[in-house]
Interface confidence: low
């Protein structure tokens, strides 16, 4: 589809006469009829196969024709065609005289023709005008012409349709040759494919509009290049979606079991040394001067009761000082001026002379200690409770309050996760460092063997002789459907075939 454009520029009819030689009265009021048709070696009358157009009266006798295209007028003249431009044409231009306003052929005088010109030739589609001038005896016509494609048509023959669009079916404008030129952000044969955000992962990301990066399931991040770990994965990472590869010091399916409580939580205070002793379990070894499960309590130097023989201890900035009772002296009141005669042993302790009476020693009853049996025994001093257990004095005895996961008199035993028989349907329980595992009997599955799964009793192909096997789902057993000539629960026995007769 295109348009043949004809630009009339100047018509000269100095004498103002018709083709017949008759002068126009009062002058030749001139209009034109144009006929465009297929190429003819000799241009002849007949149908204007490519189109026809008429002008209004453009001037009298001799005149220049104004370019009216900008004002919506009819110069250049337009001869549209709805076919592939063949590259050749024939053109007939007639100049007529119109005495009145009616330009229909039947309203004109019989000799109204002023001039008639005909040309033919080749013409390629293009923007450039071809200038031509045709002269007859009395008239001269200067004009130019060209062929251009209609809107949305392109190519050498105006045969290529291209309508710019920006919708679901394409996002493009048209190049001069009719090829598509994608709008920014679009690609593909019909510019339907958005160009995703630069760097968007080819496999894991996609987009529905330009500069977007939407992630496929299992991926995340601005460029969809980060995998999403298993839902609930606490201290783990992934290299492919839904993985949960535990960070160092963590274990379990969701990496939520702390195998390195010391590093992750630093529970020991005041420079104490921390030792991991199982899942979420630890022991703090305190530096001198500190005590408590986490060594969080600062010991007074007097807390170790350094003063003997009933001496009282006073804390000082640079240490401590013992105030000795009568009969004792020395840094720790360890030297006595007493003898057994002075009954120095308290709480029922018995006195023994030493060094020919110059000294003595007290033998203390249970629950008492000290040079003079003056101290009640603290059975927790030796910190006998293992695995972070808390020691409690209970009168003459002591007891350990254990942390979760431990038991025994001294919290020395790890509680078995299997003790509560967690595996259903006869599953076998295995204690693991980070929990337990159930080994399920046939027909059951799940973390605790809680899911009943039907056994395909036919999986082992128990039927012989091409018998058909069926699984009885209620008993998880099989049934063999024997072919003709076989019997038995597995169709393993051939039936005695009847003898063959000679007739």
């Amino acid at each position: 589809s295109g348009v043949f454009q004809l630009q009339l520029q100047e018509f000269i009819n100095e004498r103002g006469v018709l083709a017949s030689g008759r002068p126009c009265e009062p002058g030749c009021r001139t209009f034109f009829r144009v006929c465009l048709k297929h190429f003819q070696a000799v241009v002849s009358p007949g149908p204007c196969t490519f189109g026809t157009v008429s002008t209004p009266v453009l001037g009298t006798n001799s005149f220049a024709v104004r370019d009216d295209s900008s004002g919506g007028g009819r110069n250049p003249l337009q001869l549209p065609f709805n076919f592939t431009w063949p590259g050749t044409f024939s053109l007939i231009i007639e100049a007529w005289h119109a005495p009145g306003d009616d330009l229909r052929p039947e309203a004109l005088p019989p000799d109204a023709l002023i001039s008639k010109i005909a040309i033919q030739g080749s013409l390629a589609v293009g923007q450039n005008w071809l200038l031509d001038e045709q002269t007859s005896t009395l008239t001269r016509l200067r004009y130019s012409y060209r062929v251009i494609c209609s809107d949305n048509y392109y190519g050498d023959n105006c045969s290529r349709l291209c309508k710019k669009r920006n919708d679901h079916f394409g996002h493009y404008v048209c190049q001069p040759d009719g090829n598509l030129s994608c709008l920014p952000g679009w690609t593909g044969e019909y510019c339907q494919q958005p160009i995703c955000l630069s760097g968007c992962h080819e496999q894991n990301g996609y987009c529905s509009k330009p500069a977007e990066c939407l992630c496929r399931p299992g991926w995340q991040g601005r460029l969809c290049n980060e995998c999403i770990p298993h839902n609930g994965c606490r201290h783990g990472t992934c290299s492919t979606p839904w993985q949960c590869t535990c960070d160092e010091g963590w274990g379990g399916l969701f990496c939520d079991q702390d195998l390195n409580y010391c590093t992750h939580h630093s529970p020991c205070k005041n420079g104490a040394t921390c030792s991991n002793s199982g899942q979420r379990s630890y022991t703090c070894t305190c530096r001198p001067g500190y005590t408590g499960v986490d060594c969080e309590l600062e010991l007074s130097e007097c807390d170790s009761n350094p003063c003997r023989n009933g001496g009282s201890c006073k804390d000082q900035e640079d240490g401590y000082h013992c105030l000795c009772p009568p009969g004792y002296y020395g840094l720790h009141c360890e030297h006595s001026t007493l003898s057994c005669a002075d009954s120095p042993c308290f709480n029922g302790g018995s006195c023994r002379e030493r060094n020919q009476g110059a000294n003595y020693a007290c033998e203390c009853p249970p629950n008492f200690t000290g040079s003079n049996c003056e101290k009640k025994v603290d059975r927790c001093t030796s910190n006998p409770c293992a695995n972070g257990g808390q020691c409690l004095n209970r009168g003459p005895s002591r007891m350990c309050r254990c942390r979760p996961g431990f038991t025994g008199t001294y919290c020395e035993l790890h509680v078995s996760d299997c003790a509560r028989n967690p595996c259903a349907h006869g599953g076998t329980c295995h204690d693991l460092e980070n929990g337990l595992m159930c080994t399920c009997p046939a027909g059951f599955s799940g973390r605790r063997c809680e899911v009943r799964t039907s056994i395909d009793a036919c999986a082992s192909s128990p039927c012989f002789n091409r018998a058909t096997c069926y699984t009885d789902l209620s008993t998880d057993t099989f049934v063999c459907n024997c072919p003709y000539g076989f019997v038995g629960s597995r169709c393993e026995f051939p039936v005695g075939l009847p003898p063959s007769f000679p007739w």
Partner: antibody, heavy 119, light 106 residues
């Protein structure tokens, strides 16, 4: 369900005023251009006015310029048309219509409200 | 404002094809929508962007637009298709409707 419901029509004397309303539901009203189109008895459709999604752009037909004003309240999901200086030739059914994006045309129409101007 | 010109009426027998035209200068460079309106009812969009059908519109409705003419074609016309059909386009900021074509199914 996507719906447009016009109201406010009626009988009014020449030179009088009316205010038409169009209540929208079932779609995101604030995201769409909206328009008023009228149809005189026995005649074809005549476009009256159109307003952008946020109310910043308003256009109207030459026949109603200076007399009719289109507006909207996105918080109430409502489109309005203020009709002033009414003439007998304004008698018509007034339709509220949702304009689809990208030259889709008017994809949702209300049931219309009748405006009769008596001289 | 450019005028969209439609024939006032078109008659068609059931099962036959009805073609309704809508003309304007260089209409093929613009997008055209078509509406169906039955007596006493609101218009219904049947074709948009020259040839696309909204969901729920039967496949027998099709459209085309080139040069100066847009065409609505109803293939295998049914009695229920008897209605007024109006074309619509845009010119700058104005909306332009055709005068409408009454389709009668004989």
């Amino acid at each position: 369900e996507v719906q447009l419901l016009e109201s406010g029509g009626g009988l009014v004397k020449s030179g009088g005023s009316l205010r038409l309303s169009c209540a929208a539901s079932g779609f995101t009203f604030r995201s769409h251009w909206m328009s008023w189109v009228r149809q005189a008895p026995g005649k074809g459709l005549e476009w009256v006015a159109i307003i952008s999604y946020d109310g910043s752009n308003k256009y109207s037909a030459d026949s109603v310029k200076g007399r009719f004003t289109i507006s909207r309240d996105n918080s109430k999901n409502t489109l309005y048309l203020q009709l002033n200086s009414l003439r007998a030739e304004d008698t018509a059914v007034y339709y509220c219509a949702k304009a689809g994006g990208g030259n889709v045309g008017f994809d949702i129409w209300g049931q219309g409200t009748m405006v009769t101007v008596s001289s | 404002l450019p005028v969209l010109t439609q024939p006032p009426s078109v008659s068609v027998s059931p099962g036959q094809t009805a073609s309704i035209t809508c003309s304007a200068d260089k209409l093929g460079t613009k997008y055209v929508s078509w509406y169906q309106q039955k007596p006493g009812q609101s218009p219904v969009l049947v074709i948009y962007q020259d040839a696309k059908r909204p969901s729920g519109i039967p496949e027998r409705f099709s459209g085309s637009n080139s040069g100066n003419t847009a065409t609505l074609t109803i293939s295998g016309t049914q009695t229920m298709d008897e209605a007024d059909y109006l074309c619509q386009s845009w010119d700058r900021s104005d909306v332009v409707f055709g005068g409408g074509t009454k389709v009668t199914v004989l």
